[in-house]
């Protein structure tokens, strides 16, 4: 998957753009925004009818480093008695997020952006039966 | 992607930082195995706490469409398919890394940015607040 | 043909291990969650373990949590069912059985049945 | 748990006869109950789920009624072919998939 070129016509490449070699592209990682904070509602991974637990994977060759997935507590969703109704469904809300891979190659190091699928949390929806054709 | 040669003393001088910028291929690797977005796709309307989806579109960044969710009701819908009030419909919010041009307008020169998104909805039980 | 073939059974000691197969064939097999249920020789239907499309979501009779792990293989069309620390009472035919709900997703009702695997757990 | 007890046990009718089988759960399970029909020697199919539906392929002659707690299962007119044991399945509460004890119809 290739980064498209700026498509617009009235976009024209300005003079200032630095010259980058042929089939790659500079990539500044000071990130903007790097403080802007979350301000989700309080606890809703514990909340919600379909609650998730949160782990954090960690990989030193990866920009940032750390990634929190969110893994879906139980199959089904927890009824106002607080059991398991399995008549629905804990899923899975994914979103694809870049992140910066680190390759090394002998004493050499080359830089990939990657897509990945972050599981955020997750969502309680109503099965639907599968019709054979 | 593009080989950055080390100092002569590579094995002993690791750097466990990245550097502020560097050169990526052009080509971005997906990591996504084990998914397939059709199955997905439908959540938005099967959840009990449905939401709208709203395309955000900006040509300065990759990848210039994003959906932002939109959580359809207050409450959370029921057995019955009201809207059931005694409990909260709330938003699902990521921190994304997405690229800008920078300096704008050029081709291949990026920034990364940290945005954030509403993926989907989820339904609460709500909080009693109680006051001192 | 649409069907599910398990094999694997067999007598085997208390204590000791067994793993199930199931080989699916004439459908989608990644469109589906699976399951396994057996059955105790003339008694009746016990659902021992079930996984959904891609593995994220799996679940276990009490019975058999901590001992049996279930797990997939959709390029292979398979499924598995890892035993362990085998009792007496987990003497059975055990049935790999397809969930009817769509996406791979849970709705907990078989619809195709393959015809089973006996397992005999004796010393 | 849940529990589910079907009744009765074994049912002695003839070809032609209409048979009412009985399910009675612990707690209510709504409408998501299931019958199953297992034949000797064969693997259980699906027969009725959610309370009313008739899975694919299965005769008109096969209803499934009730909800909450009480669930039947009627077959207007046995075949021979129908002369089975029946299973009901629940899929309303953790843990999932609990079934019933069965009912043996026979020939009388």
């Known amino acids: 998957r290739k980064i498209p070129k700026v498509g617009h016509t009235f976009f024209q490449k300005p003079e200032s753009c630095p010259p980058v070699p042929g089939g790659s592209m500079k990539l500044d990682i000071g990130i903007i925004n790097e403080n802007q904070r979350v301000s989700m509602s309080r606890n809703i991974e514990s909340r919600s009818t379909s609650p998730w637990n949160y782990t954090v994977t960690w990989d030193p060759n990866r920009y940032p480093s750390e990634v929190v997935q969110a893994q879906c507590r139980n199959l089904g969703c927890i009824n106002a008695q607080g059991k398991e109704d399995i008549s629905m469904n804990s899923v899975p809300i994914q979103q694809e997020t870049l992140v910066v891979r680190r390759k090394h190659q002998g004493c050499s190091v080359s830089f990939q952006l990657e897509k990945v699928l972050v599981t955020v949390g997750c969502t309680c929806v109503t099965p639907v039966i599968h019709h054979v054709q | 992607g593009i080989t950055i040669p080390r100092n002569p003393g590579c094995p002993n001088s690791e750097d466990k930082n990245f550097p502020r910028t560097v050169m990526v291929n052009l080509n971005i690797h997906n990591r996504n195995t084990n998914t397939n977005p059709k199955r997905s796709s439908d959540y938005y309307n099967r959840s009990t706490s449905p939401w709208n989806l709203h395309r955000n579109e900006d040509p300065e960044r990759y990848p210039s469409v994003i959906w932002e969710a939109k959580c359809r009701h207050l409450g959370c819908i029921n057995a019955d398919g009201n809207v059931d009030y005694h409990m909260n419909s709330v938003p699902i919010q990521q921190e994304i890394l997405v690229l800008r041009r920078e300096p704008p307008h050029c081709p291949n020169s990026f920034r990364l940015e940290k945005i954030l998104v509403s993926v989907g909805c989820t339904c609460v039980t709500p909080i009693v607040h109680h006051v001192a | 043909e649409v069907q599910l073939v398990e094999s694997g059974g067999g007598l085997v000691q208390p204590g000791r291990s067994l793993r199930l197969s199931c080989a699916a064939s004439g459908f989608t097999f990644d469109d589906y969650a699976m399951h396994w249920v057996r059955q105790a020789p003339g008694k009746g239907l016990e659902w021992v373990s079930g996984i959904n499309w891609n593995s994220g979501g799996i679940g276990y009779a009490d019975s058999v949590k901590g001992r049996f792990t279930i797990s997939r293989d959709n390029a292979k069309n398979s499924l598995y069912l890892q035993m362990n620390s085998l009792r007496a009472e987990d003497t059975a035919l055990y049935y790999c059985?397809?969930?009817?709900?769509?996406?791979?997703?849970?709705?907990?009702?078989?619809?195709?049945w393959g015809r089973g695997t006996l397992v005999t757990v004796s010393s | 748990e849940i529990v589910l007890t079907q009744s009765p046990a074994t049912l002695s009718l003839s070809p032609g006869e209409r048979a009412t089988l009985s399910c009675r759960a612990s707690q209510s399970v709504r409408s998501y109950l299931a019958w199953y029909q297992q034949k000797p020697g064969q693997a259980p199919r699906l027969l009725i789920y959610?309370?009313?539906n008739r899975a694919t392929g299965i005769p008109a002659r096969f209803s499934g009624s009730g909800s909450g707690t009480d669930f039947t299962l009627t077959i207007s007119s046995l075949e021979p072919e129908d002369f089975a044991v029946y299973y009901c399945?629940?899929?309303?509460?953790?843990?999932?998939?609990?079934f019933g004890g069965g009912t043996k119809v026979e020939i009388k």
């Open positions: 399945q629940q899929r309303s509460n953790w843990p999932p998939a609990t």
């Open positions: 059985a397809r969930d009817m709900g769509g996406f791979g997703e849970f709705y907990w009702n078989f619809g195709l």
């Open positions: 959610d309370a009313s």
